[in-house]
Amino acid sequence: AGLKLMGAPVKLTVSQGQPVKLNCSVEGMEEPDIQWVKDGAVVQNLDQLYIPVSEQHWIGFLSLKSVERSDAGRYWCQVEDGGETEISQPVWLTLVPRGSSAHHHHHHHHSAWSHPQFEK
């Protein structure tokens, strides 16, 4: 059936200093090597967790404990499939000053993202 990266692309606005978890759901592959990319640079592997939902359905999580200005940018996940790199649609992470109210907006069109999860 090939690769499916599920979800909708997201514009995410977060208050400075707050935690955020991004997740990426991959279907149609056994044990994918999910990589997270920020503005074109691969994010270190140790900042992520993998969860096998089933043999061909995986979720990768990227945890950011305390979002700062340097974390703002465009994130996506990618996996290798048959020698080719499949790339998800991006999520744009933007910041508002500490204490401001943050809103996250979901733009619903075909995408490779599931919704990021907030955690306090």
Epitope: Q44, D47, L49, Y50, P52, I59, S63, K65, Q117
Partner: antibody, heavy 125, light 108 residues
């Protein structure tokens, strides 16, 4: 039930090579990272490095890079820690640790670990 | 290389609150984890992601983090809590893990 079975204690001379093992059961070996942790006698814990079973992606702590090799055999669900040339300072207990996460209904993961019982390595002339 | 600093020892009487600290420059950005190691045994994960209790850990154990310091709190310490406690976190570069030097908790 998840189990990590480590190889038995070993005594070696300085300069000798050695490979110790950690065999996993009770889960799909390739799903998770396996770390190796060193504890010298009467001392604290030191993170050596880790490997993901499926892709053999390895990462090492700066103190251990180049001195040890971490590898895995998917067919036997076994992780390995290897030395080409042991030193007396390698005398320690070595633990393997399996890292995992699960979601109970929600999508935010719960993190957990399983530790092996440890392998005591003694390097002495 | 990156370091996490813990006090070598902490002593409390049974029923008192024990606090064990861990300081590291990357802790504002990286989660702290806490382990308990009793004599002759493998370590056990007590707290993960600063403040989440691991499965099967009593409620008297809690964790917090502020700035460059993470704290493990044992409210109403019991004799069986006597052990070595280690903090653990990612380096500032995010590509390797580090343990603190360990704190020996004495409950007497």
């Amino acid at each position: 039930e998840v189990q990590l079975v480590q190889s038995g204690a070993d005594v070696k001379k300085p300069g000798a090579s050695l490979t110790i093992s950690c065999q996993a059961s009770g889960y799909t070996f390739t799903d998770y990272w396996i770390s190796w942790v060193r504890q010298k006698p009467g001392k604290g814990l030191e993170w050596m490095g880790q490997i993901r079973g499926q892709h053999s992606s390895t990462l090492y702590g700066p103190s251990f890079q180049g001195h040890v090799t971490i590898s895995a055999d998917r067919s036997t669900a076994t992780a390995y820690l290897q030395w080409r040339s042991l030193e007396a300072s390698d005398t320690a207990m070595y633990y393997c640790v399996r890292h995992g996460a699960s979601t109970s209904g929600g999508t935010i993961p719960e993190y957990y670990q399983h530790w092996g019982p440890g392998t005591l390595v003694t390097v002495s002339s | 290389s990156y370091e996490l600093t813990q006090p070598p020892s902490v002593s409390v009487s049974p029923g008192q609150t024990a606090r064990i600290t861990c300081s590291g420059d990357a802790l504002p950005k990286k989660y702290a984890y806490w382990y308990q190691q009793k004599s002759g045994q493998a370590p056990v994960l007590v707290i993960y992601e600063d403040a989440k209790r691991s499965s099967g850990i009593p409620e008297r154990f809690s964790g917090s983090s502020s700035g460059t310091m993470a704290t493990l709190t044992i409210s109403g310490a019991q004799v069986e809590d006597e052990a070595d406690y280690y903090c653990y976190s990612l380096s500032d570069s995010g590509n390797y893990f580090v343990f603190g030097g360990g704190t020996k908790l004495t409950v007497l």
